[in-house]
C-alpha cells in the first residue's frame, strides 16, 4: 500500500528505467533509481556582470542556472561549462543576441563578425571541438541609432558523462544581457544503445 | 537467470511508463491513462487572413492548428494563445519569416526592426513574460526588388497547466503567410519532478 | 483475451511497447522488440566534395551519416534523402552556413538570396512539400573581404514510414563545408496515437 503510493508519486508518468526492477520485482529500488536518473536538462541564461571586453572570440563563462528561466537538472554547471553527468543523445541549442545603441558609444568598426560556437570538450582528451556554429557578418553603420541581430543554432549530439559544453562568441561586449535573448541549453532525448 | 540477464542487457534503461499499472496489475487502467496522458505537442502555422497592419509590436492571434502541417494534441489553442494542459518541461520554438516585394509598394522606412518575442502568460498572475526573443535590424533599400529574412528561436521551459504561450512580432504586415515560413510550436519532453 | 486486445489497441506503440510481452510474461520478446524499435534519429553533416554550382535552388544530396558528428539510427540515408522507417512525430532541424572570402573570386552579384528549404516527399504520392524554410536576402559588397551568414530552422512534424526528408538551398557554392556549420537532422519525440 504505502510502497505503491510512494511509487505512484515518484514515478508518476516519468520515463522510467525498468532494468533490474522489473526482473526481480524490487519496485522501491526502481522508484528510487527512477528519481535519481530522470532525464537531464539545462537552460542557462547569460550573466552579464562579467562579460569580456574584446571583439575576438571568447568563451562565455558566466551563466545563471537557477534564476528566472534558468534551470538545471542531472547536469552540472561549473567553471563556465555545462557538464554532462549521464551518457545519452541530447538536443543542444543556443540563442545569442547582439545589440548596439548609439548611446553605448562609437563602434570600433562598422563591419562586424557576430558569431557563436557551441563546443564540446572531453576531459579524457583535453581538446575542444565545435559542434555547432552560426552567425553573420554585419554592417552596422552610424546611419541607424540602433542595431540588433540574433543567432539560433541547435542539433542532436551523443554526449558522454564528463564531457563539457561551452559557448564562445565574438564581440561579447555587444551581447544582449536579457535572459530571453542570450541563453543555451540541452535536454536528453534518449539513451545510447 | 539467463533470461533476466539478457533482459537487463538489452532493455537497459529504455524509457517505459510503469506508473500504477505495473504495481497492481491493472493493465487496462494503464492503457487508458497512457492514452489520456500522451505527451502534448502543438505546431501552429500562421493564418494570414487576419494579420494586423502597422510596424509596431503586436501579438499574433490567428494561427491554424488543424490544417496542413498544423496540429495539436493535449494542448489547447484559444484566443490566439497556446494553452498548456499538462505540467511539464517543454521545448518551445518559433520560425518567423518576413518578406517584401517592390510590387507591394514602398516601405514607410528602409530601416526595419524585424523581431519575434515568444511570451508566457499565467492566468493566476495576469502578467506576460518573454521567454525567447530574436530578430535583426535590417536595411531594406529600394535598390533590391525583393527582401527576405527569417528568425528562429527555441528553448526548454517549465510550463504549468493553464499557462499560455503567445507570439509577438514587429512589422506584422511583412510576415510571410506560408505554413512553412511562419509557425511556432511546443512539445513536452519530460515531467516536472 | 478482450482486455489484452483492448490494451494492444489503445497503448499501441506507446513508449513502453509492452503489449503482448508484458501481459503473457514473454520478457525476452519485449527486450528484443524494444531494442529494434528504439527512438530513431539522424544528424547528417554536409559532404562538400560534391556540392552543385550555380545560384539557383538545388537539392543537397551529399551528406555524411557516420563520420564526425554525423550519425543515424533507425532511419535510412539514401540518394540524398533521409528516409523515415518508423511512424511518429519528429523534431526536424537544419543549420545552413554560407560564406564568401574575396580570395574565392568576385561574386556574380552582390545581392544574394540565401535560403534553405526542408522538404518532405511521400513515395506513395510522389510530390514534394516544404515543411520549413528560412533565410535572408543579403548585400555582400566588395567593401568587406569576408562575408558569412547562417540559417537555422526547426519544427515538429508527423512523419510516416517511407517518407523522405531532403534539404534544398540557393547558392550552394557558397555553403560552408564544415560539419559544425551545415547539417540537418531529426529525432523521434513520440508515437502517433
Amino acid at each position: 500500500g504505502a510502497v505503491q503510493k510512494e511509487l505512484q508519486h515518484i514515478v508518476g508518468s516519468q520515463h522510467i528505467r525498468a532494468e533490474k526492477a522489473m526482473v526481480d520485482g524490487s519496485w522501491l529500488d526502481l522508484a528510487k533509481r527512477s528519481k535519481l536518473e530522470a532525464q537531464p536538462f539545462a537552460h542557462l541564461t547569460i550573466n552579464a556582470t562579467d562579460i569580456p571586453t574584446g571583439s575576438h572570440k571568447v568563451s562565455l563563462s558566466s551563466w545563471y542556472h537557477d534564476r528566472g528561466w534558468a534551470k538545471i537538472s542531472n547536469m552540472t554547471f561549473s567553471n563556465g561549462k555545462l557538464i554532462v553527468n549521464q551518457d545519452g543523445f541530447y538536443y543542444l541549442y543556443a540563442n545569442i543576441c547582439f545589440r548596439h545603441h548609439e548611446t553605448s558609444g562609437d563602434l570600433a568598426t562598422e563591419y562586424l563578425q557576430l558569431m557563436v560556437y557551441v563546443t564540446k570538450t572531453s576531459i579524457k582528451i583535453p581538446s575542444s571541438h565545435t559542434l555547432m556554429k552560426g552567425g553573420s557578418t554585419k554592417y552596422w553603420s552610424g546611419n541607424s541609432e540602433f542595431h540588433f541581430y540574433s543567432i539560433n543554432v541547435g542539433g542532436f549530439f551523443k554526449l558522454r558523462s564528463g564531457e563539457e559544453i561551452s559557448v564562445e562568441v565574438s564581440n561579447p561586449s555587444l551581447l544582449d544581457p536579457d535572459q530571453d535573448a542570450t541563453y543555451f541549453g540541452a535536454f536528453k532525448v534518449r539513451d545510447i544503445d | 537467470g539467463a533470461v533476466q540477464k539478457e533482459l537487463q542487457h538489452i532493455v537497459g534503461s529504455q524509457h517505459i511508463r510503469a506508473e500504477k499499472a505495473m504495481v497492481d496489475g491493472s493493465w487496462l487502467d494503464l492503457a487508458k491513462r497512457s492514452k489520456l496522458e500522451a505527451q502534448p505537442f502543438a505546431h501552429l502555422t500562421i493564418n494570414a487572413t487576419d494579420i494586423p497592419t502597422g510596424s509596431h509590436k503586436v501579438s499574433l492571434s490567428s494561427w491554424y492548428h488543424d490544417r496542413g502541417w498544423a496540429k495539436i494534441s493535449n494542448m489547447t489553442f484559444s484566443n490566439g494563445k497556446l494553452i498548456v494542459n499538462q505540467d511539464g518541461f517543454y521545448y518551445l520554438y518559433a520560425n518567423i519569416c518576413f518578406r517584401h516585394h517592390e510590387t507591394s509598394g514602398d516601405l514607410a522606412t528602409e530601416y526595419l526592426q524585424l523581431m519575434v518575442y515568444v511570451t508566457k502568460t499565467s492566468i493566476k498572475i495576469p502578467s506576460s513574460h518573454t521567454l525567447m526573443k530574436g530578430g535583426s535590424t535590417k536595411y531594406w533599400s529600394g535598390n533590391s526588388e525583393f527582401h527576405f529574412y527569417s528568425i528562429n528561436v527555441g528553448g526548454f521551459f517549465k510550463l504549468r497547466s493553464g499557462e499560455e504561450i503567445s507570439v509577438e512580432v514587429s512589422n506584422p504586415s511583412l510576415l510571410d503567410p506560408d505554413q512553412d515560413a511562419t509557425y511556432f510550436g511546443a512539445f513536452k519532453v519530460r515531467d516536472i519532478d | 483475451g478482450a482486455v489484452q486486445k483492448e490494451l494492444q489497441h489503445i497503448v499501441g506503440s506507446q513508449h513502453i511497447r509492452a503489449e503482448k510481452a508484458m501481459v503473457d510474461g514473454s520478457w525476452l520478446d519485449l527486450a528484443k522488440r524494444s531494442k529494434l524499435e528504439a527512438q530513431p534519429f539522424a544528424h547528417l553533416t554536409i559532404n562538400a566534395t560534391d556540392i552543385p554550382t550555380g545560384s539557383h535552388k538545388v537539392s543537397l544530396s551529399s551528406w555524411y551519416h557516420d563520420r564526425g558528428w554525423a550519425k543515424i539510427s533507425n532511419m535510412t540515408f539514401s540518394n540524398g534523402k533521409l528516409i523515415v522507417n518508423q511512424d511518429g512525430f519528429y523534431y526536424l532541424y537544419a543549420n545552413i552556413c554560407f560564406r564568401h572570402h574575396e580570395t574565392s573570386g568576385d561574386l556574380a552579384t552582390e545581392y544574394l538570396q540565401l535560403m534553405v528549404y526542408v522538404t518532405k516527399t511521400s513515395i506513395k504520392i510522389p510530390s514534394s512539400h516544404t515543411l520549413m524554410k528560412g533565410g535572408s536576402t543579403k548585400y555582400w559588397s566588395g567593401n568587406s573581404e569576408f562575408h558569412f551568414y547562417s540559417i537555422n530552422v526547426g519544427g515538429f512534424f508527423k512523419l510516416r514510414s517511407g517518407e523522405e526528408i531532403s534539404v534544398e538551398v540557393s547558392n550552394p557554392s557558397l555553403l560552408d563545408p564544415d560539419q559544425d556549420a551545415t547539417y540537418f537532422g531529426a529525432f523521434k519525440v513520440r508515437d502517433i496515437d
Epitope: 571586453t53 574584446g54 571583439s55 575576438h56 572570440k57 571568447v58 553605448s104 558609444g105 562609437d106 563602434l107 570600433a108 568598426t109 562598422e110 563591419y111 564581440n171 561586449s173 555587444l174 | - | -
Partner: antibody, heavy 121, light 107 residues
C-alpha cells in the same frame, strides 16, 4: 598580463622616415584596437593615431595626418607606425597602448608599453 | 578638436589628504573621459574610464565623476604612492585628446 614592447626609435634627420613597431603579448591582440601616443620631453601626453582590431578603421591627430600611417599584423601580434616627413616637433617618446574595449572607442587605454624614443634633428 | 583643460596644474598635498582634480572639455563629451596616472620615466596607467568606472586593480580611494563638460578625479585619502602626474583624456567623434596634466607633489 598585457605586455607591449616598442622598438624602432632612434635619431633621424628632418624629412626622413622611421618605422616603429610594437610587439604585443599576454592578450588576444586581434581583438583590440591599438593606439600610438607620444610625449615630448618635459611635456604632456599627445594622442597620435589609432587602429581598430581588424585594421579596417584608422584615425589620426591633425598634427600627423598625411605623414604617419598606423597598421597592424594580427598574425604577428604587431602594431606599426610608419613616420614619413619627420619634423623636429615629432621628437618624443612614442608609446603604444591597448584599447580597454575591443568593440567600442572611448573606453580608455588599459595597457601601455615603456616607450621608444624618436629624436628628429 | 575638443580642448581639455585641467586644473590645477600643480597641487601640493599631504598623505591622508582628500585631493580633487578637475577637467573641463571645450564641448560636451558625454561620459567619454578617462583618467591616467604617470610617474617619472614610466608609462601612464589607466585609473578611471567612462568618467566614473574604476579600472580593475585600481585602489578604491580613486573615484571619478561628472558628465558633459565638467569632470573630477578624487583621491579620498592620498597615499605616498599617489604622488604623480594625472592626465584626463577625452574621446569624441574619432578623436582623442589629453589634458595638459596635474602634478600632485608632496607639501
Amino acid at each position: 598580463q598585457v605586455q607591449l614592447v616598442e622598438s624602432g626609435g632612434g635619431v633621424v634627420q628632418p624629412g626622413r622616415s622611421l618605422r616603429l613597431s610594437c610587439a604585443a603579448s599576454g592578450f588576444t591582440f586581434g581583438g583590440y584596437g591599438m593606439h600610438w601616443v607620444r610625449q615630448a620631453p618635459g611635456k604632456g601626453l599627445e594622442w597620435v593615431a589609432v587602429i581598430s582590431y581588424d585594421g579596417n578603421n584608422k584615425y589620426y591627430a591633425d598634427s600627423v595626418k598625411g605623414r604617419f600611417t598606423i597598421s597592424r599584423d594580427n598574425s604577428k601580434n604587431t602594431l606599426y607606425l610608419q613616420m614619413n616627413s619627420l619634423r623636429a616637433e615629432d621628437t618624443a617618446v612614442y608609446y603604444c597602448a591597448k584599447c580597454l574595449s575591443g568593440t567600442y572607442w572611448g573606453y580608455g587605454m588599459d595597457g601601455w608599453g615603456q616607450g621608444t624614443t624618436v629624436t628628429v634633428s | 578638436d575638443i580642448q581639455m583643460t585641467q586644473s590645477p596644474s600643480t597641487l601640493s598635498a599631504s598623505v591622508g589628504d582628500r585631493v580633487t582634480i578637475t577637467c573641463r572639455a571645450s564641448q560636451s563629451i558625454s561620459n567619454w573621459l578617462a583618467w591616467y596616472q604617470q610617474k617619472p620615466g614610466k608609462a601612464p596607467k589607466l585609473l578611471i574610464y567612462k568618467a566614473s568606472s574604476l579600472e580593475s586593480g585600481v585602489p578604491s580611494r580613486f573615484s571619478g565623476s561628472g558628465s558633459g563638460t565638467e569632470f573630477t578625479l578624487t583621491i579620498s585619502s592620498l597615499q605616498p604612492d599617489d604622488f604623480a602626474t594625472y592626465y584626463c583624456q577625452q574621446y569624441n567623434n574619432y578623436s582623442w585628446t589629453f589634458g595638459q596634466g596635474t602634478k600632485v607633489e608632496i607639501k
